[in-house]
Interface confidence: medium
């Protein structure tokens, strides 16, 4: 009987791999090249193990593959002889989370690698400003997130806790609304949503500017600047100017940084400056009329940030109009 000196015994290695819901992932596994390669990928839960993908005698063996992995897994068959036993995994679902073991046997060694797969999702959140009757609300909303995120609010850079949370999706992914009543406040607010698994953070910032009092037929300049602290130079973003009226928002202008295209929905609206440096998105509204009074909202949004700037414009009758009456 031979001594085991011909064999290499490798302890079980463990790796954590993070994937995104609906996307593809590679579960890594490598081994020392040898003849007669056998590969068994298995999924282990508390009660059972399930065959994910097997390879032996020169080809993939899927007869005993669990149905949940059908048409979703493959090996890099051309690279097996070079020691690559990695598993290509398609269309991740949250149910795929868990422990995977890759058994690799060759004529010179047998090893078991352990891969812990975690699946996350973080659809870009948004910050909305809503008026309901006489009340004003800020809503931070994320349509699809997993695992549960950490949501924090700040008022004038001071953390606050009084917010109303609504969550749907019992097992995930979750849809979450966090609402803050800001009626009568002139403070600035910030909402941060953090997905610790995906190491992704989104921040929404709301600022109310001082009220602007203008006379009829004058023009008004509404400031809105991109703060460099928030946006990196190569990041795509969009700018939307809208007007809030009776709780309904109507779009006045729209700008996309990727195409550098602007669409105006109001002929009296124009940029204050040329958008050469793409940081100042202040607007001019000309030929003001009494009906232009109201709240104007500038929304600058990227995957990581939303900056909301609110202007309240009061348009008063001009002297001539007043004396004519």
């Amino acid at each position: 009987i031979f001594l085991s000196a011909f064999f290499t015994y490798v302890p079980m290695n463990e790796q954590i791999i993070i994937g995104r819901l609906g996307e593809d992932i590679i579960l890594p596994s490598s081994f020392e090249r040898g003849s007669e390669v056998v590969i068994h990928w298995k999924y282990q839960d508390s009660y059972n193990s399930y065959n994910v993908h097997s390879y032996y005698k020169g080809s993939g063996r899927l007869e005993s593959q669990d149905t949940r992995y059908a048409n979703r897994t493959s090996l890099f068959y051309n690279e097996i002889q070079n020691g690559n036993a990695s598993l290509f995994f398609r269309r991740l679902s949250l149910l795929d989370e868990g422990i995977y073991t890759c058994y690799v046997g060759t004529a010179i060694q047998a090893i078991t690698n352990k891969v812990v797969l975690k699946v996350g999702v973080f659809l870009t959140p948004m910050m909305k400003y809503e008026k309901r009757n006489t009340n004003s609300f800020l809503i931070c909303n994320v349509l699809s997130v997993y695992p549960r995120p950490i949501i924090t609010w700040k008022m004038d850079n001071t953390p606050i806790s009084e917010n109303n949370m609504q969550e749907t999706g019992s097992l995930g992914p979750f849809s979450i609304n966090s609402t803050l009543n800001i009626t009568g406040s002139n403070s600035s607010y910030e909402c941060t949503i953090e997905n610790s698994l995906l190491k992704q953070t989104w921040t929404g910032r709301w600022t109310m500017k001082d009220g602007l009092h203008k006379m009829q037929s004058e023009h008004v300049s509404l400031s809105c600047e991109l703060v460099n602290d928030y946006f990196s130079p190569n990041q795509d973003f969009k700018v939307t100017w809208s007007r809030m009226e009776s709780g309904i928002s109507s779009i006045l202008a729209y700008y996309l940084s990727s195409s550098q295209n602007t669409t105006f929905y109001e002929s009296r609206f124009s940029w204050n400056k040329e958008l050469k440096n793409q940081s100042d998105f202040s607007m001019n509204l000309t030929d003001l009329s009494l009906s232009d009074s109201g709240e104007y909202l500038c929304n600058i949004s990227s995957d990581e940030y939303t900056l909301l700037t609110i202007h309240t414009v009061h348009v008063e009758p001009s002297q001539e109009t007043a004396s004519d009456n």
Partner: antibody, heavy 120, light 107 residues
Framework: QVQLVESGGGVVQPGRSLRLSCAAS????????MHWVRQVPGKGLEWVAV????????DYADSVKGRFTISRDNSKNTLYLQMNSLRVEDTAVYYC?????????????WGQGTLVTVSS | DIQMTQSPSSLSASVGDRVTITCRAS??????LAWYQQKPGKVPKLLIY???TLQSGVPSRFSGSGSGTDFTLTISSLQPEDVATYYC?????????FGPGTKVDIK
């Protein structure tokens, strides 16, 4: 050094049961498929059963199917063969053997064997 | 089930002779064939797998060839310590049948 030590053999009457054990050491037991192979003294080798490294797959020779059950306890580094409804023709030396690779069914290490005698 | 046959069932040869043992499968088994050596009173020992791959530590005078249904084990120069019974085994699918064996001794 790879060591496989069988136990549990003995004399038993036809129709009765016996359980063989095989204690493994000197290698990572949970990484390898394991076999039982038997040999009537002075005769050839007969493959009996195999179990995968994690116990998830098992195969048997037609001559023992439905009567013998192969199992393993990886926490104890032990392989078992439960033999029910024993017949006179089951008399043999039973070897516990280790796969060279799990899923490629040939053997690179053998135990010394344990003799099972089925006789009335 | 696939049957395995070996020929001859026994042979005697002189030290230094070239010895050839044949193993035949009743159906094709690709190269999924192993050869074992069992010396008197000892347990079997793996010599060759995948029809022609020499197991670690096995002397180079042993070699294997063949594919499909016909396979051979060759001892290029028979040595006294090679006195044994040699078995082939197919391992493409269960049952993993052994051949009946070929007994080799010295003249």
């Amino acid at each position: 050094q790879v060591q496989l030590v069988e136990s549990g053999g003995g004399v038993v009457q036809p129709g009765r049961s016996l359980r063989l054990s095989c204690a493994a050491s000197g290698f990572t037991f949970s990484n390898y498929g394991m076999h039982w192979v038997r040999q009537v003294p002075g005769k050839g080798l007969e493959w009996v059963a195999v179990i995968w490294y994690d116990g998830s797959e098992k195969d048997y020779a037609d001559s023992v199917k439905g009567r013998f059950t192969i199992s393993r306890d990886n926490s104890k580094n032990t392989l078992y063969l439960q033999m029910n409804s024993l017949r006179v023709e089951d008399t043999a030396v039973y070897y516990c053997a280790k796969d060279l690779i799990s899923g490629i069914y040939y053997v690179d290490h053998w135990g010394q064997g344990t003799l099972v005698t089925v006789s009335s | 089930d696939i049957q395995m046959t070996q020929s001859p069932s026994s042979l005697s040869a002189s030290v230094g002779d070239r010895v050839t043992i044949t193993c035949r499968a009743s159906q094709g088994i690709s190269n999924y064939l192993a050869w074992y050596q069992q010396k008197p009173g000892k347990v079997p020992k793996l010599l060759i797998y995948a029809a022609s791959t020499l197991q670690s530590g096995v002397p180079s005078r042993f070699s294997g060839s063949g594919s499909g249904t016909d396979f051979t084990l060759t001892i290029s120069s028979l040595q006294p310590e090679d006195v044994a019974t040699y078995y082939c085994q197919k391992y493409n699918s269960a049952p993993f049948t052994f051949g009946p064996g070929t007994k080799v001794d010295i003249k």
